[in-house]
């Protein structure tokens, strides 16, 4: 998957663009909005009818090195009585994000952009029947 | 990717930190195995906390299109298909990394940007706020 060139005709490549070797791009990994904070409702992972746990995956050759993944706690959903209702399904909600991967080849290092799928949380869905043709 | 030679004593000079600026291959590797978008494409409708998806487009960003979830109801859908206001539909938000063209309009020069997206909604029991 290649990053598309700027497609709009009114975008002219400015003179100020840095020179970049063919087949590659320059990437500044000083993150814009680094200190922005998520203001999600408190403890939604425990209060949800499809609760989830978090695990942190850590990889020193990935930037960012820490990625948090959610896992649904139950197969079914939690009903008003606090019991698991298996007529409903807890399913993961996922979102793609970008990371930078550092690869070592002998005494050389290269960098590769990667898309990774992060499980963000879970939601409770009504199952459907598989209609066999 | 683009290979950068390391200094002669490279076995002893391993840099644990990433450099501020790197050259990366234009091809993006996709690690998303064991997933099928068809399966989850209708969760927004089947969820007890359904949501609508809104297109957010920005040609100066990669990916240029990001879909934002907005919960359809304040409450959750009960077994009878009605909205139950004893429960709350709340957005699940996630910080993701995208590429921002920097300087603007440059085809091959980017900076990482952290953005907050609402990915979907989940149904939660409300918290009772106990006033002291």
């Amino acid at each position: 998957r290649k990053i598309p060139k700027v497609g709009h005709t009114f975008f002219q490549k400015p003179e100020s663009c840095p020179p970049v070797p063919g087949g590659s791009m320059k990437l500044d990994i000083g993150i814009i909005n680094e200190n922005q904070r998520v203001s999600m409702s408190r403890n939604i992972e425990s209060r949800s009818t499809s609760p989830w746990n978090y695990t942190v995956t850590w990889d020193p050759n990935r930037y960012p090195s820490e990625v948090v993944q959610a896992q649904c706690r139950n197969l079914g959903c939690i009903n008003a009585q606090g019991k698991e209702d298996i007529s409903m399904n807890s399913v993961p909600i996922q979102q793609e994000t970008l990371v930078v991967r550092r690869k070592h080849q002998g005494c050389s290092v290269s960098f590769q952009l990667e898309k990774v799928l992060v499980t963000v949380g879970c939601t409770c869905v009504t199952p459907v029947i598989h209609h066999v043709q | 990717g683009i290979t950068i030679p390391r200094n002669p004593g490279c076995p002893n000079s391993e840099d644990k930190n990433f450099p501020r600026t790197v050259m990366v291959n234009l091809n993006i590797h996709n690690r998303n195995t064991n997933t099928n978008p068809k399966r989850s494409s209708d969760y927004y409708n089947r969820s007890t906390s359904p949501w609508n998806l809104h297109r957010n487009e920005d040609p100066e960003r990669y990916p240029s299109v990001i879909w934002e979830a907005k919960c359809r109801h304040l409450g959750c859908i009960n077994a009878d298909g009605n909205v139950d206001y004893h429960m709350n539909s709340v957005p699940i938000q996630q910080e993701i990394l995208v590429l921002r063209r920097e300087p603007p309009h440059c085809p091959n020069s980017f900076r990482l940007e952290k953005i907050l997206v609402s990915v979907g909604c989940t149904c939660v029991t409300p918290i009772v706020h106990h006033v002291a």
Epitope: V91, V125 | A79
Partner: antibody, heavy 123, light 108 residues
Amino acid sequence: EVQLVESGGGLVQPGRSLRLSCAASGFTFDDYAMHWVRQAPGKGLEWVSGINWNSGGIGYADSVKGRFTISRDNAKNSLYLQMNSLRAEDTALYYCARDMGGFGEFYWNFGLWGRGTLVTVSS
Amino acid sequence: EIVLTQSPATLSLSPGERATLSCRASQSVRSYLAWYQQKPGQAPRLLIYDASNRATGIPARFSGSGSGTDFTLTISSLEPEDFAVYYCQQRSNWPPATFGGGTKVEIK
């Protein structure tokens, strides 16, 4: 032909292990959640374990939790049940069953069954 | 854990007669009850799901009814191939897929 064929059963001593397999054919395997259901000789049916399409959701009956492990290989159209620390009460005909849920999710009704493989735990 | 009790344990009837099988749950399973048929030496076969929906290829003589705790499987006119053991199964609460003890429909 749409079918499920179980294998791997046999006579085993208490405390030992056995691995059951189920080969699926005639349908898109990873479109379905799958289960193991057992039936002791002359007795009723007992659900043992279930797994969704991508192994992201797995469940076990309390009677086998911690001893049995369900897994699947979608590339091989196969379902497995690793049974450790076997007991005499695990003696049963083990059926592989296909869930009728769409999108590889659970519906907890079983629309297609194999013929079963017999596991006998005895010293 | 939900317990499903089937009655009678054995039902002796002749071909052409009407069979009425009962399944009672220890607590409400709403409408999430299924019925299976099992013939000797064969795997079970799904007949009815969600209390009253016939599975694909199941003849119209099989019908299901009930909700909450009391459910009925009715075979309007028994055919020779209907003599078998019938199991009910719930999909409402954990643990999932709990089955009743079965009702044997035998030839009188």
